[in-house]
């Protein structure tokens, strides 16, 4: 089971109108550049076999991947939103740094790996898709971690 006290984000993180709006604007800008509408990265399949108490830990993994492998490499694009949203998401990642689960997390890593593989397979368009789904990342983090 997760060390649940550490797998928590305060509700106030998701109640800041300005940065929330910027996050959603960034997602919209990127989704307009996303031609591959047949693929969904963040959806029901991501959570398959993952209990409610493990979902924040899963979303931490997705957040970290999105920051390191998508947002940092694409940081020159989608300005001015990117320069504001990346530090916000990095702060959330930092707050989840002590979120771990005890025991086997193979089922979680398997699901996250599928997402990573899809992004990598699609190349730059996979990165654009991941940015276009930042609204879903935001909502999934909110639901899983508060």
């Amino acid at each position: 089971a997760p060390i649940s006290s550490h797998c928590r984000l305060d509700k106030s993180n998701f109640q800041q109108p300005y940065i929330t709006n910027r996050t959603f604007m960034l997602a919209k800008e990127a989704s307009l550049a996303d031609n591959n509408t047949d693929v969904r990265l963040i959806g029901e399949k991501l959570f398959h076999g993952v209990s409610m108490s493990e979902r924040c830990y899963l979303m931490k993994q997705v957040l970290n991947f999105t920051l390191e492998e998508v947002l940092f490499p694409q940081s020159d694009r989608f300005q001015p939103y990117m320069q504001e949203v990346v530090p916000f998401l990095a702060r959330l990642s930092n707050r989840l740094s002590t979120c771990h689960i005890e025991g086997d997390d193979l089922h979680i890593q398997r699901n996250v790996q599928k997402l990573k593989d899809t992004v990598k397979k699609l190349g730059e368009s996979g990165e654009i898709k991941a940015i276009g789904e930042l609204d879903l990342l935001f909502m999934s983090l909110r639901n899983a971690c508060i």
């Epitope: 109640q15 109108p17 929330t20 959603f24 919209k28 969904r40 959806g43 029901e44 398959h48 609204d135 879903l136 909502m139």
Partner: antibody, heavy 119, light 107 residues
Framework: EVQLVESGGGLVTPGGSLRLSCAAS????????MSWIRQAPGRGLEWVSA????????YYADSVKGRITISRDNAKNSLYLQMSSLRSEDTAVYYC????????????WGRGTLVTVSS | DIQMTQSPSTLSASIGDRVTITCRAS??????LAWYQQKPGKAPKLLIY???SLASGAPSRFSGSGSGTDFTLTISSLQPDDFATYYC?????????FGGGTKLEIK
């Protein structure tokens, strides 16, 4: 082409039961959340229930909780609504609709099936 | 539950008019708002999702705006086919909830 076809509506007496079906085609049914929405004669739209693609999560409106069960058979591309302890206020056209996930709109709707609860 | 309040409930307009319908949520729903068009005896059709994205097949004269609690649907130049009832719907949280509808009539 996406198609959703509801069936099973009809006249039922108060306290009675009915099972509605929705046959889906033209898309990967198991990938989609499915919802039932109803519309009483001359009234607005009221969401009734939803079920996840796997069938593992279900959601209900307070007005029907305990009287209605949503289910699906992905092998048959079918959605169901089991209704019991029916009341006159349940009289409505019942639509099935699909939405990819939790944060997705209802992008396709069936034509609906009329349920009339009357003595 | 999130309450959705739509206004006006009835709207009379002429061909070529610019028409605006508003929808207010009882709490913040980010951009998780859809607009549907319904004609008598027919199922609703999706027009707008994520508050401002045009659904596939929806005419470009329809546009949506807003975020948080206040949203609008605009028809830039009313066409004969647009006389119908319009509903907003939030999908930020279950239970999904609809506005009461706006009936658009010919003046």
């Amino acid at each position: 082409e996406v198609q959703l076809v509801e069936s099973g509506g009809g006249l039922v007496t108060p306290g009675g039961s009915l099972r509605l079906s929705c046959a889906a085609s033209g898309f990967t049914f198991s990938d989609y959340y499915m919802s039932w929405i109803r519309q009483a004669p001359g009234r607005g739209l009221e969401w009734v229930s939803a079920i996840s693609g796997s069938g593992g999560s279900t959601y209900y409106a307070d007005s029907v909780k305990g009287r209605i069960t949503i289910s699906r058979d992905n092998a048959k591309n079918s959605l169901y609504l089991q209704m019991s302890s029916l009341r006159s206020e349940d009289t409505a056209v019942y639509y099935c609709a699909r939405g990819l996930w939790v944060w997705d709109p209802l992008d396709y709707w069936g034509r609906g099936t009329l349920v009339t609860v009357s003595s | 539950d999130i309450q959705m309040t739509q206004s006006p409930s009835t709207l009379s307009a002429s061909i070529g008019d610019r028409v605006t319908i508003t929808c207010r949520a009882s709490e913040g729903i980010y951009h998780w708002l859809a607009w549907y068009q319904q004609k008598p005896g027919k199922a609703p059709k999706l027009l707008i999702y994520k508050a401002s994205s045009l659904a596939s097949g929806a005419p470009s004269r329809f546009s949506g705006s807003g975020s948080g609690t206040d949203f609008t649907l605009t028809i830039s130049s009313l066409q004969p086919d647009d006389f119908a009832t319009y509903y907003c719907q939030q999908y930020s949280n279950y239970p999904l909830t609809f506005g009461g509808g706006t009936k658009l009539e010919i003046k």
